[in-house]
Structures are given as C-alpha cells and as structure tokens.
Amino acid sequence: SERCDDWGLDTMRQIQVFEDEPARIKCPLFEHFLKYNYSTAHSSGLTLIWYWTRQDRDLEEPINFRLPENRISKEKDVLWFRPTLLNDTGNYTCMLRNTTYCSKVAFPLEVVQKDSCFNSAMRFPVHKMYIEHGIHKITCPNVDGYFPSSVKPSVTWYKGCTEIVDFHNVLPEGMNLSFFIPLVSNNGNYTCVVTYPENGRLFHLTRTVTVKVVGSPKDALPPQIYSPNDRVVYEKEPGEELVIPCKVYFSFIMDSHNEVWWTIDGKKPDDVTVDITINESVSYSSTEDETRTQILSIKKVTPEDLRRNYVCHARNTKGEAEQAAKVKQKGNGCTEPMTL
C-alpha cells in the first residue's frame, strides 16, 4: 500500500473511560495533527477508518461495527461505545485516506472499573477554588455531545460516597455545583452522575472532579523571609560547621513560580570557591501556601568564610525579598556590617 504519514502512538492522550458507560472519542488527527477538520476532509473524498490493537496483543484488527444494539459505532470523526466493556481496553487507530493520501494516529484507551463509591484508577481533573470567595461553580465535565439539547438528563451530585442533599454551603443546580464561601473542609472528590435516555435505554455518565481550596488572591503577598533575621547571630569558630537556614513563606498564588536562593558576597554558590552544600525542603499548608527552606552549610568554616556576606533571596510573582545572615567569628568582638 501507499506510504502513510504515521504519527505513532499519541501517549499525550491517555483516554480513560468507565466500564459500562457510553464513551465518545474523537479522532485526534483533526484536533492535534492536521490543519483541516473532518468535514473538509470528508468533502475532499477522504475516508476515516478505525481499527485497534487489543491490550497485550500486537495484532491490529478492524473494529466490529456489527455488534448487537450497535454497541460500537462511528459517527463522523467520533468513535462511540454504547456502552464500554472492560475488554475494549487497547490502542485505537484512526486513519484518514484516499488513493493518494494517508495519515494515521494511534491512542491508548483504558476502560476503568469503579466501585459503588466511585473509587477507581481514573485520574481526575483538579479544580482549585479560592478560600472565602463568594461563589464558585464547578460544572459536570465532558458530557457535551452525549445527548441532544432537547433531552433533559437527571443529574445527581456526590461528595465522596454521599449524595449532596442539604449541604450547608454546597448547592447542586443541575449540571453545576455551587460553593458558597468555600472552606478547606470542602476539599474532596465531587462526582456527578448524569442519566439520560436513548433509544429506550438509560445511560449513565460518571464524572469526578477533585476540589482543592487554596489561598485567596486578596491574601497574596511578596515572599516573607522568616530566617535569617536580625535576631539570630551565627557565631562560629574556624573549623566548626556553619549551618544557616533560609526559611521563606510564600502565600498561594495561582501559577506562581516561587524561588529561593543564596548569594555569598553577591555571587551564586556555584560561582564561589567555598565548599558549600545547599539542601532544600518544601512544606505546604492546607491552602497550599508554601514554606520553602534552603539550608546552607559549610562543613569546616574558615576565618575568611566568617567574613563573607551571606544573603538569602526570594521571589514570587508579587515581588522579591532578601535578608542577610549575621555571621561572626566567636570571640571576635565586631560583627561585620552587612551591605544589601
């Protein structure tokens, strides 16, 4: 056969669907690999062909579109399962071709089992909402295209295993779930179960979102350096180990890049001849505020090291901060003034 542009296995699209539920999977060619859409391709005389490789097999085989009740069907660029079965797991390929042109891509599909409390190996999207903000809505995700707008499905929301009824600050409103003045106790997995009729059968869609309540933008600050500070003097004798922690608090800021670093006499540790070790640790509060600690240590400090200027620096999207450590030689009466 003619050469085919093979985009390989698109592992970026690790599609997971629940067992015994409908699933509609769009051919990724038109979303990520080709510049034109299905309608344009179809009107140009190109045909979309589907096939698959079962889990733990190497043999590519055509998809059986003649199953009872049209369990698997294709509609335009969408492959439909009504519903899925566990053994539908495998790598699926969609190929667009005519006599002179061919392009194909494969993607993995995993059919996942769930228990009665919606626990499963499914990876859930995380939705971050700001603590104490007025109202925050989440919408039952990935249900578009499953039923026409004329169909009004029933929607039931759960937190964990518990149906959301008379929750004080969480209100189900059809496809939406509203949170009023959210608190950390609102953290958790929220599941919507959408039930809709089709051709005399009832289908269920289960979708889970992990809610994480985080610090509010109104509370966002530049970094706050707890240590070093003006109250603590690192007084050492030559030959002793010098250990200075740089402990910095960063309030949660969405997509902020938090940085902590040391300078010694204005230079990065890598650019000085001193034998320095730096170890970093990070801890998080319940609202994802971050405390980042960088411990600078010199195993055997020299008199020269005790005269150097050690400055802790921190930066986030709100600003920068810096603080010098007070280092002096034991028995030496004077403390070198630190110039910032």
């Epitope: 903000h133 009023f180 106790s185």
Partner: antibody, heavy 118, light 107 residues
Framework: EVQLLESGGGLVQPGGSLRLSCAAS????????MTWVRQAPGKGLEWVSA????????LYADSVKGRFTISRDNSKNTLYLQMNSLRAEDTAVYYC???????????WGQGTLVTVSS | EIVMTQSPATLSVSPGERATLSCRAS??????LAWYQQKPGQAPRLLIY???TRATGIPARFSGSGSGTEFTLTISSLQSEDFAVYYC?????????FGQGTKVEIK
Amino acid sequence: EVQLLESGGGLVQPGGSLRLSCAASGFTFSQFGMTWVRQAPGKGLEWVSAISYDGEGTLYADSVKGRFTISRDNSKNTLYLQMNSLRAEDTAVYYCARFRYYTAFDYWGQGTLVTVSS
Amino acid sequence: EIVMTQSPATLSVSPGERATLSCRASQSVSSNLAWYQQKPGQAPRLLIYGASTRATGIPARFSGSGSGTEFTLTISSLQSEDFAVYYCQQYNNWPWTFGQGTKVEIK
C-alpha cells in the same frame, strides 16, 4: 483600631421587619468576610448569617433562612441584616463580627438589641 | 451540622488556681476551633484560634490545645478579670457552631 458599631435594633411586633446596620472602621472592610451572631437573653451564642468579602456569597442558619437577608456596601464600609417575618424567638442581642477562615471571628461589635413582642 | 459540647457547664475556681475547660465536637474539625470570653453586658472576645494560637493581646496564662474532636482551654492562674463565660466555636464546616458555654465563677 478596628471598630464595629451596630445600629437599628428596637422593639418590633411579630411578623414585622427591621434592618440592622454595622459600620466598620480601622481596617480594609472590602478584604474581610462579615457575619452576624445573636444571643437570646440568658442564652448562648448562635451564628445567624455570613457574607463573603466581595458580597457575592451569602449563608444563613436554618432558623432564619428565607426570612433574613445579609448584604454589604463596601463603598460605605457597612454591613446590613434585613430581618422580615420576625418571630418572638428572634429576640436577641445581634452582634456583627469580622471573620477569616484562619482566625475565626476576630473582632466583634458591641451588639444591638432586637425585641419581638406584641 | 457539627454539634459542640462544652463541659462543665459551670466551673467554680479560686483566684490563682488553674481552670481547665473542655469542648467536644460531634465530628472532626481539624484545628479549626476558637475560644471566646464573654463578660456580662459585653460582646464576646476572641482568645484562641487554630485551637492553640493566642489572639492579639491575650495574656500567656490562656492556652488552648487539642485537635480533631477534643479540645481544652486552660487558664493557668485565674485572675479576677477572668471570671466570665467561655465559648468554643468550630469554623471548619458551615454552619459555624458554638458550644453552649462554660461559666467560670469564683469559688
């Protein structure tokens, strides 16, 4: 200095209405959630209602839901509680308080007495 | 809603003695618990938040401990101005709820 000053209390007949106000000063009002707490004579404290700092989110105790409305005007640094369909059991001193999740109700007003009686 | 239960209802203590007040939540409130002091004719005053952090201006003789469902407020050496009613409050879940109060009176 943070100050909260309630007003608008008084004697009202059952079924009547009253509007309480709470004037705030000494802090950036628009940055804080606010709440109303009441205390019936000789009894304990009961949370009544809360409003988010932006005024969009409101919550109510079941005992007042549908009858009371909390609101705020950040341009006037003022919190309100509109009380309708008042009942004898609503008789209490009403306090406004500032709240944050991290520190609970950290500042309180001195309270205003609402008496519902015929 | 979370029910907060305080004990004892009344505590009789001599000045200079230690007072220990208990508060129990019907379900875990993590460390989201506050203690308030209220004197007759006055508004409540925040003493402790986060179960153990003293509010601004609160003397060191007041200390809080506990997490989850069991909490304690300790007044190490009672002063005359400490005789009042003390309330615990959870602010982990809406609605935020108070205990019924413990009255600390002079023995």
